[in-house]
């Protein structure tokens, strides 16, 4: 009888260990990626930033994948996504073709199954950066709550990439899972 | 036999109550701190803001500590940190020392063990606040996901503190724990 | 005896199913509401934006209610609230009434029990949108962590609604529950 009870308890314990694991949401996915500002291509009004750090400084990733410049979702869920993008220019950096700048960020989602890209969030500002001032700076922050499916990819596009602030505290994006999909 | 079963069940119940508590992450820490307008430093230089409300209006704190102008982490974990900083100037307040302003926020982390300070997030903008307009306003928002250890301290530095908007809906910062460290 | 053990186990299982449900925070409430561009008020005055999508594109809602232009809380808790508001103007849209603009957002909470409205968060900027540039753009992002009670309502007010960017990736607000109230 005692043996039987232990077996029953083991079943209970086992099922609740599973539940406990699930209550931690399979080790809740997250990522915080900081800019690697080397070798950003040009040629379009907005360019995709493909080089980010995920394993140094503030950069980190867990239960998500970073590949080919994209943050890949490994686990279905609702995620809070965010991005902080800083632009700057100093007179010693050379001139600007125009004082009127469009400083923008676009957080996009790509589905591999249906090869299409959609903008989830955008932000930014048109700025008048006059040569009368030796230094200019501007930051954008966007954030929002989105349903993401395994295999979907998040990427960051910006205008004027040559003006990006390359500091890890300045230009970054990230995600963390908040809850499962019902 | 029945007594023995109850004892077994109590053991199961006990362990799961612990698990339940842990699944609530020991009452998940958070803080939302609003600016204390009576104690804003003057000047245009970069300063640490040390006076915040944690127990009135929107200000609140739980399982974190506020001391000496710093938000102290009591529980290891991954936290979402955020700050919203508003600057404003009205012509009735007198002239600005310069029309070219650098309005910035820096969210910093200090480790007591290794007495060093690191900027986690920065944001802001250079602004030209001309005398042609009677009122000027600008807000910065930053947010990001960071690993914080017990004893580490979060503080806020700004430039031009004398231009801060003292409203609780304008100038605040906060944190909430999202998940444990594996 | 074996029957009795099963009954005991069922009790354990039942109570833990409740706990499991609770550990999912009764299906954690959230909302992400995107602007309904067909119904944006005109003018430059401060207005409440009452028309949002909750069931198309990125718009979604769960365990919260959207009614009369307000996001209604159904479940007590601590929530992270956010808003992203984009303003834009192209010269082809005609002249602006003034080049000096105040582009602002206010996230407000209304309690029906005590019929009063309070601003939780505000952000924005004064802008000089000169005719020398053909296009102007500006985005605001605010976010913060707030205690919300069932029945309380969240709404968005902006200045210069006629300048709002009607894209779903541009102008939106949302909320997600992070934890219970102790």
């Amino acid at each position: 009888g005692s043996q039987h009870i232990r077996a029953e308890k083991a079943m209970v314990d086992g099922s609740w260990l599973d539940l406990a694991k699930r209550s931690k949401l399979e080790a809740q996915p997250f990522a915080h990626l900081t800019i690697n500002a080397t070798d950003i291509p040009s040629g379009s009004h907005k360019v995709s930033l493909s080089s980010w750090y995920h394993d140094r400084g503030w950069g980190k990733i867990s239960n998500m994948t970073f590949s080919n410049g994209k943050l890949i979702v490994n686990q279905d869920g609702f995620y809070y996504l965010y991005a902080n993008i800083c632009f700057r220019h100093h007179e010693t950096s050379g001139d600007l073709a125009t004082e009127y700048l469009q400083l923008m960020v676009y957080v996009t989602k790509t589905s591999i199954k249906i090869p299409s890209s959609h903008t989830l969030m955008k932000g930014g500002s048109t700025k008048y950066w006059s040569g009368n001032s030796e230094f200019h700076f501007y930051s954008i922050n966007v954030g929002g709550f989105f349903k993401l499916r395994s295999g979907e990819e998040i990427s960051i596009e910006v205008s004027n990439p040559s003006l990006l602030d390359p500091d890890q505290d300045a230009t970054y994006f990230g995600a963390f899972k908040v809850r499962d999909i019902d | 036999g029945s007594q023995h079963i109850r004892a077994e069940k109590a053991m199961v119940d006990g362990s799961w109550l612990d698990l339940a508590k842990r699944s609530k992450l020991e009452a998940q820490p958070f803080a939302h701190l609003t600016i204390n307008a009576t104690d804003i430093p003057s000047g245009s230089h970069k300063v640490s803001l040390s006076s915040w409300y944690h127990d009135r209006g929107w200000g609140k704190i739980s399982n974190m500590t506020f001391s000496n102008g710093k938000l102290i982490v009591n529980q290891d974990g991954f936290y979402y940190l955020y700050a919203n900083i508003c600057f404003r100037h009205h012509e009735t307040s007198g002239d600005l020392a310069t029309e070219y302003l650098q309005l910035m926020v820096y969210v910093t982390k200090t480790s007591i063990k290794i007495p060093s300070s690191h900027t986690l997030m920065k944001g802001g903008s250079t602004k030209y606040w001309s005398g042609n307009s009677e009122f000027h306003f600008y807000s910065i928002n930053v947010g990001g996901f960071f690993k914080l250890r017990s004893g580490e301290e979060i503080s806020i530095e700004v430039s031009n503190p004398s231009l801060l908007d003292p409203d609780q809906d304008a100038t605040y910062f906060g944190a909430f724990k999202v998940r444990d460290i594996d | 005896g074996s029957q009795h053990i099963r009954a005991e186990k069922a009790m354990v299982d039942g109570s833990w199913l409740d706990l499991a449900k609770r550990s999912k925070l009764e299906a954690q409430p959230f909302a992400h509401l995107t602007i309904n561009a067909t119904d944006i008020p005109s003018g430059s005055h401060k207005v409440s934006l009452s028309s949002w999508y909750h069931d198309r594109g990125w718009g979604k809602i769960s365990n919260m209610t959207f009614s009369n232009g307000k996001l209604i809380v159904n479940q007590d808790g601590f929530y992270y609230l956010y808003a992203n508001i984009c303003f834009r103007h192209h010269e082809t849209s005609g002249d602006l009434a003034t080049e000096y603009l105040q582009l602002m957002v206010y996230v407000t909470k209304t309690s029906i029990k005590i019929p009063s409205s309070h601003t939780l968060m505000k952000g924005g900027s004064t802008k000089y949108w000169s005719g020398n540039s053909e296009f102007h753009f500006y985005s605001i992002n605010v976010g913060g962590f707030f205690k919300l009670r069932s029945g309380e309502e969240i709404s968005i007010e902006v200045s210069n609604p006629s300048l709002l960017d009607p894209d779903q990736d541009a102008t939106y607000f949302g909320a997600f529950k992070v934890r219970d109230i102790d």
């Epitope: 040009s42 600007l96 073709a97 004082e99 009127y100 205008s159 004027n160 040559s162 | - | -």
Partner: antibody, heavy 123, light 107 residues
Amino acid sequence: EVQLVESGGDLVKPGGSLKLSCAASGFTFSRYGMSWVRQTPDKRLEWVASISSGGTYTSYPDSVQGRFTITRDSAKNTLYLQMSSLKSEDTAMYYCARRNFITSATDCYFDVWGAGTTVTVSS
Amino acid sequence: DTVLTQSPATLSVTPGASVSLSCRASQSISNNLHWYQQKSHESPRLLIIYASQSISGIPSRFSGSGSGTDFTLSINSVETEDFGVYFCQQSNSWPFTFGGGTKLEIK
């Protein structure tokens, strides 16, 4: 039709000064950065000066820094290059060119060129 | 300064042949490279921007490729009107610099 027409080229002695002009038409002059590019007798191209659309940024290579000044008058749709302390190595065909970019305002390619004006520095 | 080296200095071809012109940068310039054509007694004309983007009004036989330090301008089936000098120019870093040019002449 988008057009740039340079004028003011001449024969000048070393140490002398000269002012070149470039009249722009067919596009909104005030919305573009502008540059001067010269072509030396050995057919090499050298960027000489740039000015931003609003005229607040100017830049020069080390070879002409302090001697050349680029300016613009958007009301007259005209670009200028004031050259002083001229040297024999400044002898070249001077082209006025419209500066353009797609991605970053720090970029620069020249999508419209004038026919050029000849500057000869010789004693 | 970023030095652009073009090769060959001169290329003799017969009309109808296809050719490749090289431009090498002294340091990585990503894709911030542009190509110009200059016919005898004319001003330069923009052909390709950002290494590979064609310009409106330029014949499709002109194409560009490359990234980093090595770039190529290709002309598929050269026509008589294509003879002249070809220059590359970088806009990755200040000051903007041009290559020495490749002269395409009739064989």
